[in-house]
């Protein structure tokens, strides 16, 4: 639902996007994800900050927590206990890494309308959550786990060995947070709250990255993070389970690691509770092409967890690494032993399989030259999943329902024809037993969130349709967007092109390539966005292109695993190939082509600029990786193996940006990095700069003091303003 193209007579009332629009977030959209608390009820924070409970079936709603109560402790978040007796209120949010933060927590008693006094929670807390039933609390404070049977009780201290930067209990260390779990927590309640499983990460032997944080003091302070770079010593992980009913009668019980995993360095990748007395753990060899899923049962007589070899399921890749970005997680069926899981089929496409006894006997549920992306929910009779099957566009997402109660199973696309032009990229959120669900459409038109009946799929109501955004865009000249593909040497290169509003194929336009290109990523997606590149097309008349080359996701293993052990080669080649094809289209000014990217994209843009092709006049690298020896072990080794002589050291050395310093001589290069980047360390850009200086190559650079990998806040405005000036200068566009 983009505003319709207008006739010339109306064009004088329309205006182009401005950089200010982008930096102010003028055209940002809203989504509505219900906070489900039952099959038919959800919570939502109203515009005036009341926490409101909605009952879909009665149509009634009432405020369970007033904005006054929220404001009394400056709460920015809340969590209702499953028995609905208490709410935790979260304040003093203090960000740590990508997912982690600390906060102060207050417990509010809904029955008497007062905050719980006595045995208050310590501060700041690293993670806190309710049990799935009742109102037990688990929390992590100073790297140790505590348990409260009731909010007003004293806590039980479950672990005692927690130590900053050494031992992490119930929360991940840096590398597990960023590259494996993608969460701020590493503890999991069993379905009825009888048991609490948690991970212990021992970082004692991990090398530490240290960088200065300048702050406002006379002396900068040093940030130290145990951070395993490629080939370095990794964290040692153990999984324990505690009986929360009687924490003093039985200590934390360690869950055994499968023998074939324990024989060398390994990772824990995820934990899924099946029942209160059955748990599923996933493990991964350090060389990440072998994953083991282990189903463990509680042995009541010994109060231990038993993981029989017969309940170990091995997933192995012979052409790349195990899984996509992560190894997929199982979704168990009601029999509590069989499960559904996404992994590669014999043709090399990721599909849903049903595993009843062994992986070898898995029944393939979906198939085709497309990929199943996510399993949302399995009920007694239906399985809901998303895929990019519809009309063969890999950058779309639709929601499907497969009936599993009947034979043969029938498949229905729930979303394909709902708002066909406006909505081609969906996610979903399901209530208990999938009684109802919310669909959130991200585009390509203006996003819309709707509520649906889980049985009939009927739309019940619109939750958020972004009317204000739609009205605000009515007088904006938005760029045109098209998603198409190039067929080159048996490779399909999907691209998105963003064209100026008055695009004329007979004219010549400057071209900006925006690249990410990391393994298992996807940039060409049918989603709505009004962002910096929208402005560059709308106001500055540039053509912007995004290309998904080899190594990108959701188009089969051949494309995905093409970059295995060879990062920095084919991703760059495919961007260059696409640029050549764009030039052939006739509307690109080949003397004004630029490339830019952030993070992995900064790496690819740097290598593209240094490719010696002469295609690019200029380019920007924001927070680039410059050598894979500088990046995190878990991520890097997944795709590159180890930086050892007998493994892949040669390509580690060949694929650095520094090795190509000489080739930057004939391009304009802008290198940007935050000095407090915990993820892609400033070291990466420091080494590029050193190599360029040593090669006597001129370049431009900008650092952002005390900024991390996101370059947020005022730095964002400065960054985009600076990059805009650089590109306009490169393209000889007047300011």
């Amino acid at each position: 639902l983009r505003p319709p193209r207008v006739h010339n007579s109306e064009e004088n009332t329309m205006r182009a996007l401005t950089l200010k629009d982008i930096l102010n977030g003028t055209f940002s959209y809203k989504t509505f994800f219900p906070n489900w608390i039952s099959g038919q009820e959800y919570l939502h924070q109203s515009a005036d900050n009341n926490i409101v409970l909605y009952n879909i079936e009665t149509g009634q709603s009432y405020t369970i927590l007033s904005n006054r109560t929220m404001k009394s402790v400056n709460a920015s978040n809340y969590g209702l206990s499953p028995d609905r007796q208490f709410v935790y209120l979260e304040s003093d949010y203090s960000k740590l890494w990508r997912y982690s933060y600390t906060a102060t927590y207050y417990i509010y008693d809904l029955s008497n309308g007062e905050f719980v006094r006595g045995n208050e929670l310590p501060r700041p807390i690293q993670y806190l959550c309710w049990s799935p039933v009742g109102s037990k609390l688990a929390y992590v404070y100073q790297n140790n786990i505590y348990l409260k049977q009731r909010p007003g009780d004293p806590p039980f201290q479950i672990t005692f060995n927690g130590r900053e930067n050494k031992i992490f209990n119930g929360i991940p260390d840096w590398v597990y947070e960023e590259e494996m779990l993608a969460t701020k927590y590493a503890l999991w309640w069993s379905p009825n709250g009888k048991f609490l499983a948690y991970a212990e990460f021992n970082d004692t032997d991990i090398p530490v990255i240290a960088y200065s944080y300048y702050g406002d003091e006379q002396y900068p302070r040093t940030i130290n993070i145990p951070y395993p770079k490629a080939g370095a010593k990794n964290p040692f992980v153990r999984i324990f389970i505690i009986d929360t009913t009687y924490p003093a009668y039985v200590g934390p019980q360690e869950v055994p690691v499968p023998a074939m995993i324990a024989s060398s360095d390994y990772y824990f990748s995820w934990l899924t509770w099946v029942t209160d007395e059955r748990v599923c753990l996933q493990w991964l060899k350090r060389v990440q092409n072998v994953s083991v899923l282990s189903i463990c049962d509680f042995r009541e007589d010994w109060q231990t967890w038993d993981c029989p070899k017969t309940q170990e399921h091995i997933e192995e890749s012979r052409t790349g690494w195990a899984g996509g970005f992560f190894v997929s997680t199982p979704v168990f069926s009601y029999d509590a032993i069989s499960y559904y899981k996404i992994f590669s089929d014999k043709d090399g496409y990721k599909h849903i399989h049903y595993i009843k006894d062994t992986v070898e006997n898995a029944i393939q549920i979906t198939s085709g030259k497309w990929e199943a992306i996510n399993i949302f929910r399995v009920t007694q009779d239906s399985l809901f999943y998303s895929s990019n099957e519809f009309e063969d566009y890999p950058g779309r997402r639709n929601i499907y329902r497969i009936s599993i109660g009947s034979y043969p199973p029938s498949k229905k696309c729930v979303t394909c024809h709902l708002r066909k032009e406006r909505c081609q990229y969906y996610t979903a959120s399901f209530s208990d037993y999938a009684k109802y669900y919310a669909l959130v459409c991200y585009g390509p038109g203006i996003p819309i969130s709707t509520l649906h009946d889980g049985r009939t799929d009927q739309e019940i109501k619109i939750l958020e349709e972004n009317k204000e955004l739609e009205n605000a865009l009515k007088n904006i000249q938005l760029p045109k967007e098209e998603i198409k593909k190039l067929e080159v040497d048996e490779i399909t290169l999907w691209y998105k092109m963003i064209l100026p509003p008055q695009f004329d194929r007979s004219k010549k336009y400057p071209l900006l390539i925006q690249v990410y290109g990391g393994p298992c990523s996807q940039s060409v997606r049918s989603v709505f966005a009004v962002n910096w590149i929208s402005y560059l097309a709308s106001k500055e008349g540039m053509v912007i292109a995004l290309v998904d080359g080899r190594g990108t996701a959701f188009q089969g293993d051949k494309l995905l695993y093409a970059v295995y052990r060879k990062l920095g080669v084919y991703e760059v080649e495919d961007q260059i190939t696409a640029v050549r094809k764009f030039i052939e289209m006739g509307f690109i000014d080949e003397k004004r082509i630029a490339i830019w990217g952030w993070s992995y994209g900064g790496y690819v843009s740097s290598l593209a600029l240094a490719s010696g092709t002469g295609l690019f006049k200029c380019g920007i690298a924001v927070a680039p990786v410059s050598s894979w020896e500088y990046y995190a072990s878990v991520y890097t080794e997944r795709f590159m193996g180890l930086p050892t002589k007998d493994d892949n050291l040669e390509h580690y050395k060949n694929s650095t940006v520094m090795a190509r310093a000489e080739y930057f001589r004939n391009v304009d290069y802008l290198l940007i990095h935050g000095t407090a980047d915990d993820n892609v360390h400033f070291q990466n850009s420091a080494q590029i700069a050193k190599a360029l200086v040593n090669a006597q190559v001129d370049f431009q650079a900008m650092w952002y003091s005390d900024q991390n990998h996101g370059l947020s806040g005022l730095s964002t405005n400065h960054l985009y303003t600076h990059m805009t000036h650089f590109l306009k200068q490169c393209f000889s566009l007047s300011d």
Epitope: F156, Q157, I158, F160, T245, Y246, A248, Y249, E300
Partner: antibody, heavy 121, light 107 residues
Framework: EVQLLESGGGLVQPGGSPRLSCEAS????????LSWVRQAPGKGLEWVSA????????YYADSVKGRFTISRDNSKNTLFLQMNSLRAEDTAVYYC??????????????WGQGTLVTVSS | AIQMTQSPSSVSASVGDRVTITCRAS??????LAWYQQKPGRAPKLLIY???TLQSGVPSRFSGSGSGTDFTLTINSLQPEDFATYYC?????????FGQGTRLEMK
């Protein structure tokens, strides 16, 4: 009035296998976890084993794990401790104790009078 | 296992005196601590749980305080029936452990 009455103690040879019993009255038996706590002559107290109200959860001190088995018969309001492979260091007065505090704080608000188990050849 | 250390091991006092017994845990036990009284040839009797909560039927001259690792049992105005051995017990972690006991005897 809560009452707990232990029996089954006596002189046992090393390696012997006596079974202790504890008859309870005066409270809803199946609602409470029960424990065995022992006290060696002239020494302090040592928790031995516990069992949840339903009998599903059975818990042991490391010193007796694999040798002792706790059980209960809720229909007869009786708690048991099957002791196997007895050693001299198991010599003690064995108390049956009822858990008191309801929020999983492991305290014992009522105790039996104890039964002495002497392990000697 | 968490070790509980009581001090003193024994104390002599007179009727009417105020007596304080301390208990130290080798690791934090929050407030999960109980105090018991045991007389020769008898079973222990619960006096205090959750560090400071008086068990019903126990005289108010008994009081408990502390949290974390350091705890105190105080008997105000000692009575003849209070001469006994007192044990602290932690209920935070496996296994539940007792202090070695403090013998309170008549001066």
């Amino acid at each position: 009035e809560v009452q707990l009455l232990e029996s089954g103690g006596g002189l046992v040879q090393p390696g012997g296998s006596p079974r202790l019993s504890c008859e309870a009255s005066g409270f809803t038996f199946s609602s409470y976890a029960l424990s065995w706590v022992r006290q060696a002559p002239g020494k302090g107290l040592e928790w031995v084993s516990a069992i949840s109200g339903s009998g599903g959860g059975r818990y042991y001190a490391d010193s007796v794990k694999g040798r002792f088995t706790i059980s209960r018969d809720n229909s007869k309001n009786t708690l048991f401790l099957q002791m196997n492979s007895l050693r001299a260091e198991d010599t003690a007065v064995y108390y049956c104790a009822k858990e008191g505090y309801s929020s999983s704080g492991t305290y014992w608000d009522h105790w039996g009078q104890g039964t002495l188990v002497t392990v000697s050849s | 296992a968490i070790q509980m250390t009581q001090s003193p091991s024994s104390v002599s006092a007179s009727v009417g005196d105020r007596v304080t017994i301390t208990c130290r845990a080798s690791q934090g036990v929050s407030s999960w601590l109980a105090w018991y009284q045991q007389k020769p040839g008898r079973a222990p009797k619960l006096l205090i749980y959750v560090a400071s909560t008086l068990q019903s039927g126990v005289p108010s001259r008994f009081s408990g305080s502390g949290s974390g690792t350091d705890f105190t049992l105080t008997i105000n105005s000692l009575q003849p029936e209070d001469f006994a051995t007192y044990y602290c017990q932690q209920a935070n972690s496996f296994p539940p452990t007792f202090g070695q006991g403090t013998r309170l005897e008549m001066k």
